[in-house]
Interface confidence: medium
């Protein structure tokens, strides 16, 4: 629980690794500058939204490795008694909208399965990821626009749902879960785009950035 020092450190998302890297780079460049965290977070979030799949890739790899570490450590972790209660999840809550990548996958998964019937689920997922990464951003736009519209609808629905209120016993847990969920949406709502060029002072200049409209 909260005070259990033996509990494995929680797994970090790709975005969290990106922010950590941003902070470290900022510290290196401006060691004496004090950071306005809300402004910094906003900048990070905006930059993340415009990063290409390749740029995001290294952070996703870090997140994968951290997830593996977390799962490994959790296998041997024994929580203290009374620590196994699950957070309540209201089945009536609006479903989180699919991302542009998810919509893309829904369209292309059957095609891949049709062309390669023997592929494992993992290999199909890998192929879909590669296809998405190699899709120019202008070709991603139909999925992005549809995802944006679904997200808009979801935000209206979730606001209405919250206004109605939740079952009393569950209120506390759900609000907390949704708060962190909302933050994640803000950070990761836009899918990777293959369109932003890096400035000279940024790292990994050899990374493919190419354009094809945002």
């Amino acid at each position: 629980g909260k005070g259990d020092p033996k509990k494995p450190r929680g797994k970090m998302s790709s975005y969290a690794f990106f922010v950590q890297t941003c902070r470290e780079e900022h510290k290196k460049k401006h060691p004496d500058a004090s950071v306005n965290f809300s402004e910094f977070s906003k900048k990070c979030s905006e930059r993340w939204k415009t990063m290409s799949a390749k740029e995001k890739g290294k952070f996703e790899d870090m997140a994968k490795a951290d997830k593996a570490r977390y799962e490994r450590e959790m296998k041997t972790y024994i929580p203290p008694k009374g620590e196994t209660k699950k957070k309540f999840k209201d089945p009536n809550a609006p479903k989180r909208p699919p991302s542009a990548f998810f919509l893309f996958c829904s369209e292309y998964r059957p095609k891949i399965k049709g062309e390669h019937p023997g592929l494992s689920i993992g290999d199909v997922a890998k192929k879909l990821g590669e296809m998405w990464n190699n899709t120019a951003a202008d070709d991603k736009q139909p999925y992005e626009k549809k995802a944006a519209k679904l997200k808009e609808k979801y935000e209206k629905d979730i606001a209405a749902y919250r206004a109605k209120g939740k079952p009393d016993a569950a209120k506390k847990g759900v609000v907390k879960a949704e708060k962190s969920k909302k933050k994640k949406e803000e950070e990761e709502d836009e899918e990777d785009e293959e369109d932003e060029e890096e400035e000279e002072d940024e790292e990994d200049e050899e990374e493919e950035e190419d354009d094809d409209d945002e």
Epitope: K43, E46, R47, K49, Q141, K145, D210
Partner: antibody
Framework: AVQLVESGGGLVQPKESLKISCAAS????????MYWVRQAPGKGLEWVAR??????????YYADSVKGRFTISRDDSKSMVYLQMDNLKTEDTAMYYC????????????????WGQGVMVTVSS | YELIQPPSASVTLGNTVSITCSGD??????AYWYQQKPDKSIVRVIY???ERPSGISDRFSGSSSGTTATLTISDTQAEDEADYYC???????????FGGGTKLTVLG
């Protein structure tokens, strides 16, 4: 600061050839897809050609009006993009702009794009 | 694939004007707006339907609904007199498309 500077324009006769150039600076050129856009006198803007980056095999795309006559190319080592125009027609008379459509500035996407000042190509007998 | 814009629009100084751009692919594609001043310099004023690039006045705003994208300029100034072009990407051509342009006249 980002700069795109076109050169090589001039007056040519129909069916002749001309090569215009664009020198880029202030950004990582090899990461940027590049375009040529033109504007005939008193007319609107028209996309002419596009060249992608090395990881995209320098793929090229052309407007139907110039296909088979114009060739876009680039030299990443010199941060240059070129437009070779062959078998020129009077309707190719226009101001030709070199453009790099998008950038990220520092950590924040600014949504700014960059255009050169343009170079005039006149095709007349 | 075409993007249709009215050839001209006029507005009285200080008022609001909207310029439309119609295209079958706009429900699926983002619209971008460019301003070309009489000196022929070109600046993008809106990207991704409604995003404003840094350095562009907040008097410029964009929206998109169905097959129509709209550029709105509020509290119009004399310096806003220019040609405005919408553009959108189109995957089959692998080149974007420009609208025909709208000449905006600001009346004193």
């Amino acid at each position: 600061a980002v700069q795109l500077v076109e050169s090589g324009g001039g007056l040519v006769q129909p069916k002749e050839s001309l090569k215009i150039s664009c020198a880029a600076s202030g950004f990582t050129f090899s990461n940027a897809a590049m375009y040529w856009v033109r504007q005939a006198p008193g007319k609107g803007l028209e996309w002419v050609a596009r060249i992608r980056t090395k990881p995209n095999n320098y793929a090229t795309y052309y407007a139907d009006s110039v296909k088979g006559r114009f060739t876009i190319s680039r030299d990443d080592s010199k941060s240059m993009v070129y437009l070779q125009m062959d078998n020129l027609k009077t309707e190719d008379t226009a101001m030709y702009y070199c453009t790099a459509p998008r950038r990220t500035e520092g950590i924040v996407s600014s949504g700014v794009d960059y255009w050169g000042q343009g170079v005039m190509v006149t095709v007349s007998s | 694939y075409e993007l249709i814009q009215p050839p001209s629009a006029s507005v009285t100084l200080g008022n609001t004007v909207s310029i439309t751009c119609s295209g079958d692919e706009l429900p699926k594609r983002y619209a971008y707006w460019y301003q070309q001043k009489p000196d022929k310099s070109i600046v993008r004023v809106i990207y991704k339907d409604s995003e404003r690039p840094s350095g562009i006045s907040d008097r410029f705003s964009g929206s998109s609904s169905g097959t129509t994208a709209t550029l709105t300029i509020s509290d119009t100034q004399a310096e806003d007199e220019a040609d405005y072009y919408c553009h959108s990407t189109y995957s089959d051509d692998k080149l974007p498309v420009f609208g025909g342009g709208t000449k905006l006249t600001v009346l004193g």
